[in-house]
Interface confidence: medium
């Protein structure tokens, strides 16, 4: 999910963050504690075990969607909730897991053969009816690889890593999701105690690529717990 | 096609409030982040101020910030730019932009001049 | 804030030449980097993004390349059309900052 700070995945070996970001949530996260707000030296996660609050589904992870947590619940108070399983109810796409959509209010396969023609229709409706790609191919395309061959490159839009192409995961920048290379050793990563600690962040970093892990550098283990650096390290 | 049209552009004196509007048309408007980005006379462009497509996340330039404030209706498909507390400095012309991807502003609009004078 | 700085601020060139234009970011934003093209009294236009990728319609004669701190936009054979000011512009980070514009005039 929003697992990283405000760092490139090109920026090796320097703790975040270069600047920040003067984001002003509205009050549905502004509400919540211990959120990360972008801007200050300082990075506190969320409680370990405190809902990650949302107000799109772009903020939450690609198994997730933004909703309230209670039935017909006050839509002021949204957190990320586990995407829904096939056969599942749901309301729109993003409420399916990946590799599923939201047909007649049922989470269903995308393999399905007359998937193509109504995920065509809605994210040609999602992103609007024109050429709203920068890639000079239909946003459609990038979005699963099972329907479509054509994989987006660095810096296109995507909805899950399975939509980049190889060497690249999709990860949040700003108000987006695009396709960002997936970080090599040495460079800075981010390492969360568990699924759902995220912080309120601006840039998403991609996982450390094969063979390599997540772990705190070796000259940092004396820092404090917050300021601790973690790197892409071989296993 | 996609349309953007800024309008609510005049003169204004110092400390004076201004708001201006951008009527988008030809694609789902509440599916993308916009921005507002001027130019001043004869000078190069600054980025001021962006907002989410639900409009739940708004960021400022430093130079406005506390001063303008960016909002938008997705029923009505409108960007908005309310300017308070306005200063010579801030005569230029004003465009709205649509983002694409991460700030990439991908369509423009044709700009409307504000100008901050006694 | 990051720091865009183009050079030159303006060049003059004949139909048919190369052109390189370059940006320059004070700290390093990756592949960040866009860069547009604006004539007098129009808005701008996107003409590449993420350092390199070329925006449907843009023609093949415009090209980018870079990543880090060092940017160039390089047109490779100049059309009357692409007398103009182009902009560089870092989206690494809020604020989001372009570089002081190059004209590129007729030589």
């Known amino acids: 999910t929003l697992n990283s700070v405000l760092n490139s995945n090109a920026i090796k070996n320097l703790p975040p963050p270069l600047g920040g970001a003067a984001g002003h949530p509205g009050s549905a996260v502004s509400a919540a504690p211990g959120i990360l707000y972008p801007g200050g030296n300082k990075y506190q996660t969320i409680d370990n075990y405190q809902p990650y609050p949302c107000a799109e589904d772009e903020e939450c992870g690609t198994d997730e969607y933004c909703a309230s947590p209670t039935r017909g619940g006050d839509a002021g108070v949204q957190i990320c909730l586990a995407c829904r399983k096939r056969r599942k109810r749901c309301m729109r796409h993003a409420m399916c897991c990946p590799g599923n959509y939201c047909k007649n209010g049922i989470c269903v396969s995308s393999d399905q053969n007359h998937f193509r023609g109504e995920i065509e229709e809605t994210i040609t409706e999602s992103f609007g009816n024109d050429h709203s790609t920068l890639d000079g191919y239909s946003r459609r395309t990038t979005l699963s690889s099972k329907m479509y061959h054509t994989k987006g490159q660095e810096g296109s839009v995507c909805l899950r890593s399975s939509d980049c192409a190889s060497g690249l995961c999709c990860a949040r920048h700003f108000w987006s999701k695009i396709c960002k290379p997936v970080l090599k050793e040495g460079q800075v990563c981010t390492k969360h105690r568990r699924k759902g600690s995220h912080g309120l962040e601006i840039f998403q970093r991609c996982y450390c690529g094969e063979g390599l892990s997540c772990r705190i550098q070796k000259d940092h283990h004396q820092a404090s717990n917050s300021s601790r650096l973690h790197t892409c390290q071989r296993h | 096609e996609v349309q953007l049209l800024e309008s609510g552009g005049g003169l204004v004196q110092p400390g004076g409030s201004l708001r201006l509007s951008c009527a988008a048309s030809?694609?789902?408007?509440?599916?993308?982040?916009m921005s507002w980005v001027r130019q001043a006379p004869g000078k190069g462009l600054e980025w001021v101020s962006a907002?989410?497509?639900?409009?739940?996340?708004?960021y400022y330039a430093d130079s406005v910030k506390g001063r303008f404030t960016i909002s938008r209706d997705n029923s009505k498909n409108t960007l908005y730019l309310q300017m308070n507390s306005l200063r010579a400095e801030d005569t230029a012309v004003y465009y709205c932009?649509?983002?694409?991807?991460?700030?990439?502003?991908?369509?423009w609009g044709q700009g409307t001049l504000v100008t901050v004078s006694s | 804030d990051i720091q865009m700085t183009q050079s030159p601020s303006s060049l003059s060139a004949s139909v048919g030449d190369r052109v390189t234009i370059t940006c320059r970011a004070s700290?390093?934003?990756?592949?960040?980097l866009n860069w547009y093209q604006q004539k007098p009294g129009k808005a701008p236009k996107l003409l590449i993004y993420?350092?390199?990728r070329l925006r449907s319609g843009v023609p093949s004669r415009f090209s980018g390349s870079g990543s880090g701190t060092d940017f160039t936009l390089t047109i490779s054979s100049l059309q009357p059309e692409d007398f103009a000011t182009y902009y560089c512009?870092?989206?690494?980070?809020?604020?989001?900052?372009f570089g002081g514009g190059t004209k590129v005039e007729i030589k």
């Open positions: 700290h390093s934003i990756s592949s960040y």
């Open positions: 030809g694609f789902t408007f509440s599916r993308f982040a």
């Open positions: 512009q870092q989206n690494y980070n809020t604020p989001f900052t």
């Open positions: 993420t350092a390199s």
């Open positions: 932009a649509r983002d694409i991807a991460a700030a990439s502003f991908d369509y």
């Open positions: 907002i989410s497509g639900s409009g739940a996340y708004t």
